[in-house]
């Protein structure tokens, strides 16, 4: 039985040209996290973080994605096209797969705030 819960940074906004941290956190389970996958709204992979072997940053994002902090991901040099959904997929043993959702809005305005509160989707 899957007892865990994914907490995410929920809906966040950031300024064009700036950077943003995408974070998910798995709680309420003793399952071992073997891998965390980060995907974009069009289902393309940004990065994979294997618990033991480290990070794999996908070619299209190598210049703009920095691993971390932790199991999270830092997306840099934001463009308006980065607006949309992002998903973290936690592969765990023995529970299986947990998935969290973050919505990022990239704003032209210099008053864009980056909120870092955690939400349970």
């Amino acid at each position: 039985m899957m007892t865990g819960t994914i907490e995410t940074t929920g809906n966040i906004s950031a300024k064009k040209g700036g950077s943003v941290i995408l974070q998910c956190h798995l709680s309420s389970t003793m399952a071992q996290v073997t891998q965390v996958n980060w995907e974009q709204h069009d289902h393309s992979l940004l990065a994979i973080r294997n618990a033991e072997l480290g990070w794999h940053i996908y070619p299209a994002f190598k210049d703009r994605v920095a691993p971390g902090p932790g199991l999270g991901l830092t997306l840099q040099s934001l463009t308006m096209n980065d607006t949309g959904e992002y998903f973290c997929t936690y592969h765990t043993y023995p529970d299986g797969t947990y998935r969290g959702r973050i919505f990022l809005e990239v704003l032209e305005s210099s008053v864009a705030e980056h909120s870092a509160r955690f939400q349970i989707p």
């Epitope: 996958n37 996908y58 592969h91």
Partner: antibody
Framework: EVQLQQSGPELVKPGASVKISCKTS????????MHWVKQSHGKSLEWIGG????????SYNQKFKGKATLTVDKSSSTAYMELRSLTSEDSAVYYC????????????WGQGTTLTVSS | DIVMTQSHKFMSTSVGDRVSITCKAS??????VAWYQQKPGQSPKLLIY???YRYTGVPDRFTGSGSGTDFTFTISSVQAEDLAVYYC?????????FGGGTKLEIK
């Protein structure tokens, strides 16, 4: 030039253990993960597991847990795989394969080590 | 475990022909797929990754495409030296798994 040089062919008896080595050169050993892949005769490839030489962290295919143990010796830039309680099912060619930088594709491969388990 | 199915174990083609090898994942694997070539008596060689990027030095007649569960590897104009077995592999979820291989035979 990156090179992965594996140890020679092994002929061992059922129940025994064997340790295959993969000596690397031409790059910084601790910066890239090393993987091991099994290829039974005329068959496909199976991922056994991988090791992060920097910290010794390992990720195994559950199927090979208890069968294979992956280690490294940083001082000699060598990766090892020990296989235990050998049976005829373990007879195969075993490859070490190095990933790219922040990439899981196996960019460089050893030449393979043929293991024959027979009484 | 995710099963990668290459429906054709063998494919026969002629020099100059276009040939496509397909690979189907039993579960969603996004774009976490690579393709390898193994010539007789040799170690496998990375050709394509992620799943449409050619590795350094790989001729441009080799291309890859796909996303989700369905992937295709194409040789636009087969050469005699392309005689080999081609494998797909997923690294979306451990254990990372390979397809059964497709042996390309030249008529």
């Amino acid at each position: 030039e990156v090179q992965l040089q594996q140890s020679g062919p092994e002929l061992v008896k059922p129940g025994a253990s064997v340790k295959i080595s993969c000596k690397t050169s031409g790059y910084t050993f601790t910066e890239y993960t090393m993987h091991w892949v099994k290829q039974s005769h005329g068959k496909s490839l199976e991922w056994i597991g991988g090791i992060n030489p920097n910290n010794g962290g390992t990720s195994y295919n559950q199927k090979f847990k208890g069968k294979a143990t992956l280690t490294v010796d940083k001082s000699s830039s060598t990766a090892y795989m020990e296989l235990r309680s050998l049976t005829s099912e373990d007879s195969a060619v075993y490859y070490c394969a190095r990933s790219g930088h922040m990439d899981y594709g196996y960019v460089y491969w050893g030449q393979g080590t043929t293991l024959t388990v027979s009484s | 475990d995710i099963v990668m199915t290459q429906s054709h174990k063998f494919m026969s083609t002629s020099v100059g022909d276009r040939v496509s090898i397909t690979c189907k994942a039993s579960q969603y694997v996004s774009t976490a797929v690579a393709w390898y070539q193994q010539k007789p008596g040799q170690s496998p060689k990375l050709l394509i990754y992620s799943p449409s990027y050619r590795y350094t030095g790989v001729p441009d007649r080799f291309t890859g495409s796909g996303s989700g569960t369905d992937f295709t590897f194409t040789i636009s104009s087969v050469q005699a030296e392309d005689l080999a077995v081609y494998y797909c592999q997923q690294h979306y979820s451990t254990p990372w798994t390979f397809g059964g291989g497709t042996k390309l035979e030249i008529k």
